[in-house]
Amino acid sequence: GITNINCSGHIWVEPATIFKMGMNISIYCQAAIKNCQPRKLHFYKNGIKERFQITRINKTTARLWYKNFLEPHASMYCTAECPKHFQETLICGKDISSGYPPDIPDEVTCVIYEYSGNMTCTWNAGKLTYIDTKYVVHVKSLETEEEQQYLTSSYINISTDSLQGGKKYLVWVQAANALGMEESKQLQIHLDDIVIPSAAVISRAETINATVPKTIIYWDSQTTIEKVSCEMRYKATTNQTWNVKEFDTNFTYVQQSEFYLEPNIKYVFQVRCQETGKRYWQPWSSLFFHKTPETVPQVTSKAFQHDTWNSGLTVASISTGHLTSDNRGDIG
């Protein structure tokens, strides 16, 4: 970019230095160089001399015109050809930007991950603006009417300690940049309704050699929430189809879930939970692998989730977590 140039004149942009992408713009250059009546004025964009659409307005001023300017950023400067000077003389430079006003933020969502100490709020910012866009998150207590504001460039983590105005709040987001400002709808939240329980983790698996062999999955969470609903999904690693089991869970002790699985097959398990009746689920837990034995009983432990095989413990590949994505796009 262009900063701290010693100017011998002036460069300016119409309609503005920051403008809406796709507009027609004019860049003006006015020379003020001692003992120089410029023979010619030149414009450079990102260091490359422009050859077209330059109009001389008077002895000291020229205009460069761009139609449908689509570059998010450009560094412009202009020079003068002075008599008796071998080199062009720098007049001045300016960084210009094009972009869009912000869209109305929508899909405003706030959650509290248990034990995080924060309320995390996110929203759909809409299309890329290309220019510096700031967001102000407003949090207003419905009990005390007190309002707090938080400035951010993307999402926001708000300490739950700062939410002293009871349990019920309105949250909304203002988006602003040089080209405009928009405000989201208000989201009403109750702090007790937006808690996502502490992550559920599968710790080990064992297959018991009975008449019909059964696999027991051991899993737990550090949550203090009393009523928790969980889903566990499992499939053979070669399969594209998950089986899902639902559980109403009380995590005062390690959970044991029984499955009747095919012998000598590598399975993958995941679990996730939510506070019963609430809106938000945990993400699916890391992938937990367990290979069922041909006949011999086996145990797979979380500590041994890597591809080593031996006669006593049978253990399987490392967990890789679940798919997450921030890609924008249509639903489907």
């Epitope: 969502t109 995390t120 996110t122 983590n157 594209q240 809106r279 689920w281 997450t324 890609n327």
Partner: nanobody, 122 residues
Framework: QVQLQESGGGSVQAGGSLRLSCAAS????????MSWYRQAPGKKREFVSA???????SYADSVKGRFTISQDKAKNTVYLQMNSLKPEDTAMYYC????????????????WGQGTQVTVSS
């Protein structure tokens, strides 16, 4: 915002078939799995099936082998083909977007449809 519209419910004899559709409209920055849940009178809402964004599918044990979930990406629609229907499949069937947690730790809102009624008589 995302809107979900279910259709295809109705009354059918045991052993019969129905095909439910869930059409999603609207624009979102989130990654979603598309799920079907159901709720019978006096019972809690239960998971039925999902079409996951990684291309895998999920089924509850009670419907596995009888129900098939599929997706038409061009139409932003998820289908639930229900065969060999039983009286215990009688319920209101709801379509749901199941969001992934973002890398920021933030969350996208889940959306529910209004539901479509399925009645299976013996």
């Amino acid at each position: 915002q995302v809107q979900l519209q279910e259709s295809g419910g109705g009354s059918v004899q045991a052993g019969g078939s129905l095909r439910l559709s869930c059409a999603a409209s609207g624009y979102t920055y989130c990654s979603y799995d598309m799920s079907w849940y159901r709720q019978a009178p006096g019972k809690k809402r239960e998971f039925v099936s999902a079409f996951n964004s990684d291309g895998t599918t999920s089924y509850a044990d009670s419907v596995k082998g009888r129900f098939t979930i599929s997706q038409d990406k061009a139409k932003n629609t998820v289908y639930l083909q229900m065969n060999s229907l039983k009286p215990e499949d009688t319920a209101m069937y709801y379509c749901k977007t199941d969001p992934h947690v973002q890398s920021s730790g933030g969350y996208c809102p889940p959306y529910w449809g209004q539901g479509t009624q399925v009645t299976v008589s013996s």
